[in-house]
């Protein structure tokens, strides 16, 4: 899709990066078997995918985490796919929740999010989790991407 | 997308097949409500989707399995989406992990994987799991597919 | 993809709606950050996405639910993506199953379904669950959509 100079393919797939930051926003990198089709989509500050062209995008994220019910808060592990449009407050596009496992020391679980959304030029999408220290960064476990329809 | 003779649609969706083989690579079939757009994508040996054209593809897999913590190994159930490019070693594109359930005789869980990847002509993608005997093959539970952007 | 008047983009993303109906078919609404590209895809009776054009579609659904093993039936929570083509019986395209949590009062879990399917003009897709009262309708938790390739 998006063939020709006027309509280039726009797609990205980035790989999770462990971070010492205490922020709940996950960090990503162009490493391993990543995709970055061209400069019409960019990874900014290692935390958000930003698009230059308006349009419909299929946006997805996968988060694998390892947690234990006793060692975690009562609240479930929640992953959120969020949007920040220029001049607007950020907003949640998609969320998924998984109750912590009773397995010890922790039980791994994977969450997948995906949906079609209209993005404005300069819009950014990012992934937020309740506890980034529980996220699994082994090969292929946690990733984030989009494709323009 | 991919309209016209020069740019045909390329897409596939195949259905899980129970197998007596001991391999960890899942088996698939063109049965039920399957999709195989044309011969630019093929199901080879019932185990891998092979593409003829280079490009960006959204590749996905869904695996439903039924396992029990006591009857299974300590390691979680892991599903991996893997790539084999001509003349290259195989590599993992995506993985998801779910700790086994304490439900008896077994507890069902579903895993979904998906992402955008560049494939070379002749590249094949396949799905690997830690224990194929635990996979659920009821209608719609386990499937595998791709679409070319 | 699908550029120009002859080939408009066709995509939808709708948001879950709590319902007092006892039906197992989930209800959806064009609310929040929804997508409805044009009248070539419509939400009918708040329960099904109906397409006007034949073709290959990537169809997806995400369902978050909260359940407890003791309070639920022995059977797992199952979400099904179903197809109703004109003059045909409905059929299951995709299913996912998750065993109920032992967390109290209930444990949240998320299911994601997605795949590529051929739809005929007038075909409708809908989502069915074993217990709609367990579905979570908080922002972003439960959604349903499609895009035409």
């Amino acid at each position: 899709m998006q063939k020709g100079d006027q309509n280039p393919q726009i797609a990205a797939h980035v790989i999770s990066e462990a971070s010492s930051k205490t922020t709940s926003v996950l960090q990503w990198a162009e490493k391993g078997y990543y995709t970055m089709s061209n400069n019409l989509v960019t990874l900014e500050n290692g935390k958000q995918l930003t698009v230059k062209r308006q349009g419909l995008y299929y946006i997805y994220a996968q988060v694998t985490f390892c947690s234990n019910r006793e060692a975690s808060s009562q609240a479930p592990f929640i992953a959120s796919l969020c949007l920040k449009s220029p001049g607007r407050f950020e907003r949640i596009l998609l969320r998924a929740a998984n109750t912590h496992s009773s397995a010890k020391p922790c039980g791994q679980q994977s969450i997948h999010l995906g949906g079609v959304f209209e993005l404005q030029p300069g819009a950014s999408v990012f992934v937020n989790v309740t506890d980034p220290s529980q996220v699994s960064h082994g090969t292929g476990f946690t990733s984030f991407g989009l494709l323009k329809l | 997308m991919q309209k016209g003779d020069q740019n045909p649609q390329i897409a596939a969706h195949v259905i899980s097949e129970a197998s007596s083989k001991t391999t960890s690579v899942l088996q698939w079939a063109e049965k039920g409500y399957y999709t195989m757009s044309n011969n630019l994508v093929t199901l080879e040996n019932g185990k891998q989707l092979t593409v003829k054209r280079q490009g960006l593809y959204y590749i996905y897999a869904q695996v439903t399995f039924c396992s029990n913590r006591e009857a299974s190994s300590q390691a979680p159930f892991i599903a991996s989406l893997c790539l084999k490019s001509p003349g290259r070693f195989e590599r993992i594109l995506l993985r998801a992990a779910n700790t086994h359930s304490s439900a008896k005789p077994c507890g069902q869980q579903s895993i979904h994987l998906g992402g955008v990847f560049e494939l070379q002509p002749g590249a094949s993608v396949f799905v690997n799991v830690t224990d194929p005997s635990q996979v659920s093959h009821g209608t719609g539970f386990t499937s595998f597919g791709l679409l070319k952007l | 993809m699908q550029k120009g008047d002859q080939n408009p983009q066709i995509a939808a993303h709708v948001i879950s709606e709590a319902s007092s109906k006892t039906t197992s078919v989930l209800q959806w609404a064009e609310k929040g950050y929804y997508t409805m590209s044009n009248n070539l895809v419509t939400l009918e009776n708040g329960k099904q996405l109906t397409v006007k054009r034949q073709g290959l579609y990537y169809i997806y659904a995400q369902v978050t639910f909260c359940s407890n093993r003791e309070a639920s039936s022995q059977a797992p929570f199952i979400a099904s993506l179903c197809l109703k083509s004109p003059g045909r019986f409905e059929r299951i395209l995709l299913r996912a199953a998750n065993t109920h949590s032992s967390a109290k009062p209930c444990g949240q879990q998320s299911i994601h379904l997605g795949g590529v399917f051929e739809l005929q003009p007038g075909a409708s897709v809908f989502v069915n669950v074993t217990d709609p009262s367990q579905v979570s309708h908080g922002t972003g938790f439960t959604s349903f959509g499609l895009l035409k390739l």
Epitope: - | K84, R88, F89, R91 | -
Partner: nanobody, 124 residues
Framework: EVQLLESGGGLVQPGGSLRLSCAAS????????MGWVRQAPGKGLEWVST????????YYADSVKGRFTISRDNSKNTLYLQMNSLRAEDTAVYYC?????????????????WGQGTLVTVSS
């Protein structure tokens, strides 16, 4: 820090069998091909066998084909070499090695990390 620790070597009679193991740590095991290289007394290094990252491809030197079997357990980060029908000429120090190659090569310069080795002696 990458570490490769071999075990399982020893003295065995001709025609006998041994199983070598190599415990790996300090890197993502399943991302890399692994191999075995040996050095007979007074001889140079000889490539023995390589296995692809997920075990789908196995490669052997002609001198060991049909007698040796390489395998791996990615869940345990462990590489194995099952040696059957051993001969006196198999006597060597066997090294486990991590490959940096993305496709098969018997060129030992593509192994970027090596273990300390385990001695296999085949003698009556």
């Amino acid at each position: 820090e990458v570490q490769l620790l071999e075990s399982g070597g020893g003295l065995v009679q001709p025609g006998g069998s041994l199983r070598l193991s190599c415990a790996a740590s300090g890197f993502t095991f399943l991302d890399y091909a692994m191999g075995w290289v040996r050095q007979a007394p007074g001889k140079g290094l000889e490539w023995v066998s390589t296995i692809s990252p997920m075990g789908m491809g196995t490669y052997y030197a002609d001198s060991v084909k049909g007698r040796f079997t390489i395998s791996r357990d990615n869940s345990k980060n462990t590489l194995y070499l099952q040696m059957n029908s051993l001969r006196a000429e198999d006597t060597a120090v066997y090294y486990c090695a991590k490959s940096s190659a993305i496709s098969f090569t018997s060129d030992i310069s593509n192994f970027d990390y090596w273990g300390q080795g385990t001695l296999v002696t085949v003698s009556s």
